[in-house]
């Protein structure tokens, strides 16, 4: 470290160091002045600082503070941003796999239902993806729509293959009958429960991660108050006015200043702690029907079982539906 | 009984079931994230101290600056004098947080409430309750295994969850330290749908 400089009667030292912050020398006194106009670096005697220099010091101090805050949160911010992206993509891939499993199940077990089934399955899983990303879709409606669309195809292709498949009139009747007669048993309800619970939890998990990013971004880009700027200037730059270029602030003093500057930010602490603990609780509960990976990747099996249920009761159903939708069928055959 | 879906696969491989215990699942990945987040639980309360430790502070010097003058590092003046004649620090604290901070606190309160609601066991319908509704098929036992595949002879059980996603192993600019990646080695009649994602730090 350089030896302590001799007393500076000319402000040469201060002028030189001020150029680091502001090119040119017009704001720096040639020789020490009383400094009665100073508001932050209040002098005990003559000073080498001017009001303009003080303003520049304050601006720099606040920028320093913003940089310190950003570097403090960099690791945390990276952790959440990275994971939010990873989980979002992972969930999309789970949905894609679940759709592929379901399509494969139809292709392998019920080839006569494709390609219509592919279309309905595709729409269902598109809605699932949109829901996870925050779209305002009702899960029960999604599931109902899937079964409402599937049943006419199952009826006309599996249960009653003699019917032409362009039967729009009967399709409407069959859609209605599907719910009234509970043709799929309790399977739609099972799927509703599992899908809605697992997707709700997934959606809120992603929402929580994205809010985490927003919290860090907000505190990262805080503009510090003028009062804080004054405190920081006093701590980091006022020593320069006395030609003390190499001194550092006292530790306890720094803590007092930072607590003053951070008073507002620190108020987040309580809610931040709660956020992490609540997120932990949510994650601990994300299993079985609260785990979308588990639920969606098993959907093809439940859908398969629901179709088997229909086939098992095909005799009864055909008779009942024959009566219920007779009017539509007659019109169609004319 | 349903065939296990095997075509229409992105990789066109026949899907079999993974029982590899060490592979990373979404669930293990979530727990790993929570553990890392918990190390930041005091982030906001620790900020003032963190910033002081990352900005110039007299550590080994005999003298330090207290905002007004050079003082001995361990003297009472070191913390006190610099605060005199500045402005009222108490007043600064009483002003309360900026509007943007208040807004973010409100959002945190809201998400915390949602998270708590979602985590409450009371509101949860367990698989068991659904069994009482009397399905004629499609029932799965209430053990740790989940049923995948139709009921009957061909039913396949998957232990807990299918594993992490092969397609997601994109480069994440993360540590490549040895031992970080837990890539599975599928045995005969096992393929892993999900592979390791790379560790996010």
């Amino acid at each position: 470290q350089p030896p302590p400089p001799p007393p500076d009667a000319t402000c040469h030292q201060v002028r030189s160091f001020f150029q680091r912050l502001q090119p040119g020398l017009k704001w720096v006194p040639e020789t020490p002045v009383p400094g009665s106009d100073l508001q932050v670096c209040l002098p005990k005697g003559p000073t080498c600082c001017s009001r303009k220099m003080e303003e520049k010091y304050q601006l720099t101090a606040r920028l320093n503070m913003e940089q310190l805050l950003q570097s403090a949160s960099m690791e945390l911010k990276f952790l959440i941003i990275q994971n939010a992206a990873v989980f979002q993509e992972a969930f999309e891939i789970v949905v894609r796999h679940a759709k592929n499993y379901t399509n494969a199940m139809f292709k392998n077990n019920y080839p006569s239902l494709t390609p219509q089934a592919f279309e309905f399955v595709g729409e269902f899983f598109t809605d699932v993806s949109l829901y996870i990303l925050g779209s305002d879709i009702n899960v029960d409606d999604m599931v109902n729509e899937l079964f409402d669309s599937l049943f006419p195809v199952i009826y006309t292709q599996l249960m009653n293959p003699g019917l032409p498949d362009s039967a729009l009139d009967i399709n409407e009747c069959l859609r209605g009958a599907r719910r009234d007669l509970k043709v799929f048993g309790n399977f739609p309800k099972l799927i509703m429960t599992q899908v809605s619970k697992s997707l709700q939890v997934t959606r809120i998990f992603l929402q929580a991660l994205n809010l985490g990013i927003e919290v860090i971004n907000t505190t990262d880009h805080l503009k510090f108050s003028k009062d804080c700027g004054r405190m920081l200037t006093r701590m980091w730059y006022c020593s320069y006015c006395q030609g003390l270029m190499m001194v550092k602030p006292c530790g306890g003093y720094c803590n007092v200043v930072m607590q003053g500057c951070m008073a507002g930010v620190v108020e987040i602490d309580k809610y931040w702690r709660e956020y992490i603990l609540s997120l932990e609780e949510l994650v601990n509960g994300m299993y079985r029907i609260y785990d979308m990976e588990n639920v969606l990747l098993g959907l093809f099996s439940t859908i398969h079982d629901s179709i088997q249920y229909v086939q098992k009761n095909a005799g009864k159903l055909t008779t009942t539906i024959g009566k219920l939708c007779a009017h539509s069928q007659q019109r169609q055959y004319r | 009984s349903a065939y296990y879906p095997e075509d229409l696969f992105i990789d066109k491989k026949v899907l079999k079931v993974a029982h590899v215990e060490h592979e990373e699942t979404l669930s293990s990945r979530r727990r790993e994230l929570i553990q890392k987040l918990k190390s930041f639980i005091s982030f906001y309360s620790a900020l003032p101290g963190y910033i002081c430790s990352h900005s110039p502070v007299a550590e080994n010097d005999t003298l330090c600056w207290n905002g007004q003058e050079l003082v001995e590092r361990y003297s009472q003046k070191a913390a006190r004098n610099g605060m005199k004649n500045q402005f009222n620090l108490h007043e600064l604290k009483m002003k309360g947080p900026e509007p943007v901070v208040s807004q973010i606190i409100d959002k945190l309160k809201h998400i915390n409430q949602l998270l708590r609601t979602m985590s409450m066991p009371k509101g949860r319908v367990l698989d068991k309750n659904l069994d009482e509704e009397g399905f004629e098929s499609g029932d799965c036992g209430d053990d740790e295994d989940e049923c995948i595949g139709g009921s009957g002879d061909g039913m396949i059980k998957v232990k807990n969850q299918l594993r992490f996603l092969a397609e997601l192993a994109y480069d994440l600019d993360v540590d490549d330290a040895p031992g970080n990646s837990q890539q599975a080695t599928p045995k005969d009649n096992e393929i892993s749908t999900f592979h390791n994602l790379g560790n996010v730090h």
Epitope: R20, L21, N64, W236 | P56
Partner: nanobody, 118 residues
Framework: QVQLVESGGGLVQPGGSLRLSCAAS????????MSWVRQAPGKGLEWVSA????????YYADSVKGRFTISRDNSKNTLYLQMNSLRAEDTAVYYC???????????WGQGTTVTVSS
Amino acid sequence: QVQLVESGGGLVQPGGSLRLSCAASGFTFSSYAMSWVRQAPGKGLEWVSAISGSGGSTYYADSVKGRFTISRDNSKNTLYLQMNSLRAEDTAVYYCAKEALTGVFDYWGQGTTVTVSS
């Protein structure tokens, strides 16, 4: 343990050139701005030049502008000061300094002496 070690000083004739180096260790070099500061015999400290962490921005005192060039090699953790058209008034001990914050120095080297004389 932060260490800054300057080298490259010596005796040079007016109008001549010298290149000072500063080898840094003990911190993430590329994350910090660095400065050169000098002290002429019997005089106070004088800030000479600064460079941002990435090396993208440079700053000079009026007294050396156009004659001195600051640069850094982050892969080698080294700071440089190329001094051309040297004058007698450039005679000083040259220190390299780590900037903890803009214009706030927390670590200094031990200095290297530059003497400009005919």
